[in-house]
Amino acid sequence: MKVLQEPTCVSDYMSISTCEWKMNGPTNCSTELRLLYQLVFLLSEAHTCIPENNGGAGCVCHLLMDDVVSADNYTLDLWAGQQLLWKGSFKPSEHVKPRAPGNLTVHTNVSDTLLLTWSNPYPPDNYLYNHLTYAVNIWSENDPADFRIYNVTYLEPSLRIAASTLKSGISYRARVRAWAQCYNTTWSEWSPSTKWHNSYREPFEQH
């Protein structure tokens, strides 16, 4: 039994890191393998992650971690019984994929303005709380070409757009994702989408 693709890990910079790897043949990850991990820290202890299958030869492990700080470094040991298959390390701050924003809501009762709000996925004491920026994707269910992205580069988790920038009388969906420039993170997954019916009063034409 050998590792074909070494484990690569990504952290949510809060409490979970996800490691994926591939074996050289079909493997029952949960019964045959164990990923041991430990924070390099005086007060830490070793933890064991039981991997799940991710395709025939692929394995994935979800590591529960202490709250992350930038200096953290974890040792990783992949075992098959008594055999050490791979040994490595992982710095969560260097491989961050933020959590997806939540609670996306479209407020349509503000005088021909659409107000989209969502929740920051981090608690205020987390470093990323004040460092996330967002991308909002709005698209029409009726017209695949009517697809737009709004970059929200300020900290407030909200976006205002004029209802008139979208077509009236049809349904739209929106979703939002996040990233943090400070740690050069990847984008988060998209939030669940929310749907609304766009309608606004057309201004009277002046003759």
């Epitope: 830490s44 971690m65 202490d66 709250d67 200096a71």
Partner: antibody, heavy 115, light 109 residues
Framework: EVQLVESGGGLVQPGGSLRLSCAAS????????MFWVRQAPGKGLEWVSG???????SYADSVKGRFTISRDNAKNSLYLQMNSLRAEDMAVYYC?????????WGQGTLVTVSS | EIVLTQSPGTLSLSPGERATLSCRAS???????LAWYQQKPGQAPRLLIY???SRATGIPDRFSGSGSGTDFTLTISRLEPEDFAVYYC??????????FGQGTKVEIK
Amino acid sequence: EVQLVESGGGLVQPGGSLRLSCAASGFTFSRNAMFWVRQAPGKGLEWVSGIGTGGATSYADSVKGRFTISRDNAKNSLYLQMNSLRAEDMAVYYCARGRYYFPWWGQGTLVTVSS
Amino acid sequence: EIVLTQSPGTLSLSPGERATLSCRASQSVSSSYLAWYQQKPGQAPRLLIYGASSRATGIPDRFSGSGSGTDFTLTISRLEPEDFAVYYCQQYDHSAGWTFGQGTKVEIK
């Protein structure tokens, strides 16, 4: 908002015992190492003890064998049991949250050791 | 045990002046594990700098940290009235644990 509130300080005679508590709120207590740092009157800061998320502990040489740190994750609380207290243990005791350094501190509780 | 020695013990300066505080370690310290704190009378310490040079949340940019190995520096570019306080450096070591310097008092001249 992160809050750390110490209690349990007071006047104790040399050789006596005292138990300090720290009530934590505003963060996930169970995922954080916690510490006690003290400051004698007019003196500098001294790290006393720390406890990891899994219960691993460490102590300064000056308190080893006399002080015991513990935590109750269900109660979001940190404790310091201090036995065989000496005059040199007299200080303000701070509860702190952190790891390699301490971003969050309580306001401290004063322990006075005097006969 | 790693010993941190801060100098000078007291620094007498006027508002608007530049303050340079030194912290010397008895053996090499990882920059990732070197921090600076400010403490005012009757208050808990406040983290200013971590990782030798990163400012903590909410700390003004007049505070900066530098250094590596055994020599570290905290610089306050222009002293404001609220900056007069005692400053401590602190290190963490995987075997020796946590130690603080004895402090530098920055007082009004």
